[in-house]
C-alpha cells in the first residue's frame, strides 16, 4: 500500500520513464542531410516526455540506456526508384556534443523503400541525436511510414 | 527492504506491465485483409499478460504508451515472388472504436519477403489493433517468421 | 521519499533490469554458422548488465519476458551481391540447454543487405541464445551496422 502511494506521489519523470516519439517535419537544405523532427499531441500521436527538440533534433535529458528506434520510408517509391537512386543511407548518431559524436545505427535502402531498426545504446544528458539521410530521395512525411523515437530503459 | 516486499505483494498487473506476443492463426476471408492472431502458452512462446484477443484482434486493457512491434514473412517467398505480386502492404492500426481509427505503422514488401518494424504509440483501454495485409500473398505461419506484440512502456 | 530511498539502495539487478547490447566479434569456423559476439565499455557502446557471454554466445541470468533485437548487415554488399548469394538467412534461437532449443526469430536477406527485427519472448536463467547466419556472405563488423541485444521486460 505504501509503495503504491509513493508511486502515485512521485512524478513519472523521477522514475526515469523518459520517452519520445517523433514525426518528420522536413528535410534540411541541400547540403544538410539531417531530417528535422517534430512532436506533440497537437500533431497527432507524437510526443516528448523528458527529451526535448532542439531545432528539430532530439536532445536527451536523462542519463541511461535507451532503446532507439526508427523507420523511414521514401516518398512515392518503388524498388526501381530505390535501386536507381542508390546509395540512399540512413544513419542515426550522436551529433553533439562533438566530443561524443558517433554513428549508432546505419542502414541502406538498396532495392527497398523502407528501413526500420532499433538498438540499445547508452545516452547522456545533453546528447543530441541526428538522423542523416544521404542520397537524393525525399522521405515520406506520413506519420505511419516515417517516425523516430527513444525510450529510457535503465540507468 | 520495505520496497522489495511491497513489490512482491503487488500483482504485476498493478505495475502496468501489460505485454503480449502473438502468432498468426489465419488470414481472413477474401475481402477481409485482417490477419487473425492467437496466443497462449499452449501454443508455444506466445502469451497475453493484460491485453486480450477479440476474434483474433488484440484489445488493449490499460491506458499508456506502448511499444508495438511486428514481423510478417510471406510464405514460400523469393524476391521474384514479392516483386511479381507487388504491391503487398502491411498496416497496423487502431480499428476500433471507430472514433479512434488510425494507421500506426505501414510497410510495403517491394522485393523483400519480410517486413519488421516497431514504434511507440499511445493506446487507450478498449483500443483494438488490427493488422491488415493487402495484396494476394499468403503470410507464413511459422512462429519465428510472423509475430505481433505490444509492450506497455509508461502511463 | 521512502520509495526513492529504497530504489537507490537496491541494486539495479534486483529490479530485474537485465540488459545487454553486443557487437560482432567474429564468425565461426566454416561448418559453424554461429556469430560470435562481444560486449563491454572498453569496446565502445556495447555492454552486459546481467546476462553474460559464454564463448561469444549470450547467456541469460534472469527468468522473464525479454525483448530480443538484432540487426545484421552483410559486408561490402549490394542488392546484386545479396541476390547472387541467396539464400542468406539469419536465425536467433535458444541453442542450449538442448531441451529448450527453438528458433525465435528468422529472416532472409533476399535482395537486401541488412535485416533488422525484434520480438518479445520468455527466456529462463541459463538459456543461451545463438545467432546463426547461413550462407557464404560475411557480416559487417561495424558497430552501427551489426548488433544484437536483449532487454528484460517483465517476470
Amino acid at each position: 500500500q505504501r509503495f503504491a502511494q509513493a508511486q502515485q506521489q512521485l512524478p513519472l519523470e523521477s522514475l526515469g520513464w523518459d520517452v519520445a516519439e517523433l514525426q518528420l517535419n522536413h528535410t534540411g537544405p541541400q547540403q544538410d542531410p539531417r531530417l528535422y523532427w517534430q512532436g506533440g499531441p497537437a500533431l497527432g500521436r507524437s510526443f516528448l516526455h523528458g527529451p526535448e527538440l532542439d531545432k528539430g533534433q532530439l536532445r536527451i535529458h536523462r542519463d541511461g540506456i535507451y532503446m532507439v528506434h526508427i523507420q523511414v520510408t521514401l516518398a512515392i517509391c518503388s524498388s526501381t526508384t530505390a535501386s536507381r537512386h542508390h546509395p540512399t543511407t540512413l544513419a542515426v548518431g550522436i551529433c553533439s556534443p562533438a566530443s561524443r559524436s558517433i554513428s549508432l545505427l546505419r542502414l541502406s535502402f538498396h532495392q527497398g523503400c523502407t528501413i526500420a531498426s532499433q538498438r540499445l545504446t547508452p545516452l547522456a544528458r545533453g546528447d543530441t541525436l541526428c538522423t542523416n539521410l544521404t542520397g537524393t530521395l525525399l522521405p515520406s512525411r506520413n506519420t505511419d511510414e516515417t517516425f523516430f523515437g527513444v525510450q529510457w530503459v535503465r540507468p | 527492504q520495505r520496497f522489495a516486499q511491497a513489490q512482491q505483494q503487488l500483482p504485476l498487473e498493478s505495475l502496468g506491465w501489460d505485454v503480449a506476443e502473438l502468432q498468426l492463426n489465419h488470414t481472413g476471408p477474401q475481402q477481409d485483409p485482417r490477419l487473425y492472431w492467437q496466443g497462449g502458452p499452449a501454443l508455444g512462446r506466445s502469451f497475453l499478460h493484460g491485453p486480450e484477443l477479440d476474434k483474433g484482434q488484440l484489445r488493449i486493457h490499460r491506458d499508456g504508451i506502448y511499444m508495438v512491434h511486428i514481423q510478417v514473412t510471406l510464405a514460400i517467398c523469393s524476391s521474384t515472388t514479392a516483386s511479381r505480386h507487388h504491391p503487398t502492404t502491411l498496416a497496423v492500426g487502431i480499428c476500433s472504436p471507430a472514433s479512434r481509427s488510425i494507421s500506426l505503422l505501414r510497410l510495403s514488401f517491394h522485393q523483400g519477403c519480410t517486413i519488421a518494424s516497431q514504434r511507440l504509440t499511445p493506446l487507450a483501454r478498449g483500443d483494438t489493433l488490427c493488422t491488415n495485409l493487402t495484396g494476394t500473398l499468403l503470410p507464413s505461419r511459422n512462429t519465428d517468421e510472423t509475430f505481433f506484440g505490444v509492450q506497455w512502456v509508461r502511463p | 521519499q521512502r520509495f526513492a530511498q529504497a530504489q537507490q539502495q537496491l541494486p539495479l539487478e534486483s529490479l530485474g533490469w537485465d540488459v545487454a547490447e553486443l557487437q560482432l566479434n567474429h564468425t565461426g569456423p566454416q561448418q559453424d554458422p554461429r556469430l560470435y559476439w562481444q560486449g563491454g565499455p572498453a569496446l565502445g557502446r556495447s555492454f552486459l548488465h546481467g546476462p553474460e557471454l559464454d564463448k561469444g554466445q549470450l547467456r541469460i541470468h534472469r527468468d522473464g519476458i525479454y525483448m530480443v533485437h538484432i540487426q545484421v548487415t552483410l559486408a561490402i554488399c549490394s542488392s546484386t551481391t545479396a541476390s547472387r548469394h541467396h539464400p542468406t538467412t539469419l536465425a536467433v534461437g535458444i541453442c542450449s540447454p538442448a531441451s529448450r532449443s527453438i528458433s525465435l526469430l528468422r529472416l532472409s536477406f533476399h535482395q537486401g543487405c541488412t535485416i533488422a527485427s525484434q520480438r518479445l519472448t520468455p527466456l529462463a536463467r541459463g538459456d543461451t541464445l545463438c545467432t546463426n547466419l547461413t550462407g557464404t556472405l560475411l557480416p559487417s563488423r561495424n558497430t552501427d551496422e551489426t548488433f544484437f541485444g536483449v532487454q528484460w521486460v517483465r517476470p
Epitope: - | 510464405a75 517467398c77 505480386h85 494476394t136 500473398l137 507464413s140 505461419r141 | -
Partner: antibody, heavy 120, light 111 residues
Framework: QVQLKQSGPGLVQPSQSLSITCTVS????????VHWVRQSPGKGLEWLGV???????DYNAAFISRLTISKDNSKSQVFFKMNSLQADDTAIYYC??????????????WGQGTSVTVSS | DIVLTQSPASLPVSLGQRATISCRAN??????????MHWYQQKPGQPPKLLIY???NLDSGVPARFSGSGSGTDFTLNIHPVEEEDTATYYC?????????FGAGTKLELK
Amino acid sequence: QVQLKQSGPGLVQPSQSLSITCTVSNFSLSTYGVHWVRQSPGKGLEWLGVIWGGGYTDYNAAFISRLTISKDNSKSQVFFKMNSLQADDTAIYYCARNNYYGNLYAMDYWGQGTSVTVSS
Amino acid sequence: DIVLTQSPASLPVSLGQRATISCRANKSVSASGYSFMHWYQQKPGQPPKLLIYLASNLDSGVPARFSGSGSGTDFTLNIHPVEEEDTATYYCQHSREFPLTFGAGTKLELK
C-alpha cells in the same frame, strides 16, 4: 459466376505452333493469375506456366524455350502460344484461375479445355 | 521436380462407405506453417475441380463429406460417406515450388 472460355484449333501440323485464347469473366486479370495445364493419357496432368496479375510469367522449365503466355486485361483475355509442336504434345489444354492467394498456386476455376491433336 | 505418387490407382468402394486416397511426395511440401498440397476431382469429359487446398481446407461449395489431412510428404483424401456422384478420378497437386506437379490420379469406382 466465374468463367473461363477457351478457343483454339483442334488440329496442328507437326513443327507448327499452337495458339489458344482464354477469355475470362466475373474476375479481374489484374488481380488473379491464370495457369495453363495440359492433360494427355501418357503423361497425365502437366503444369505449363502461369501469368500473374502484374503481367509477370512463370514457366515450367521443360517448356520455357517454346512457350509464351501473355494477356490483355482490358479484353479479359489470356493468350497461350507454344511453338514447335510434336506428336507427344497431343493433349487437352486447359486454362485455370489461380486461387486468390498468389503464392498458393491452387487452381479454383478451369476452362472447358481445348483438345489438340498434332498430326500431319 | 517433386514427384507425387498416388495410391491406389483404382479404388472400388460401396455407397455410404469411406474412401481413402493417399498421395506421397518424394520430398516435403510443407513450409511456412502450411502444407502446399491440393486435391482435385475430375469427371469424364470435364476439367478438374478444386476440392481441397493447403491439405485440409475445403474449397467453397465442396460438401463436408470430403476431408484432407497430412503434412510433410504424406497426405490423405477421405470421402465419407461415398455418394454416387463421387465417381471420378482424384488428383493431388503440390505447389511447394516450380514446377507444380500432379499425381497420376486415383479412379474411384462404385462396387
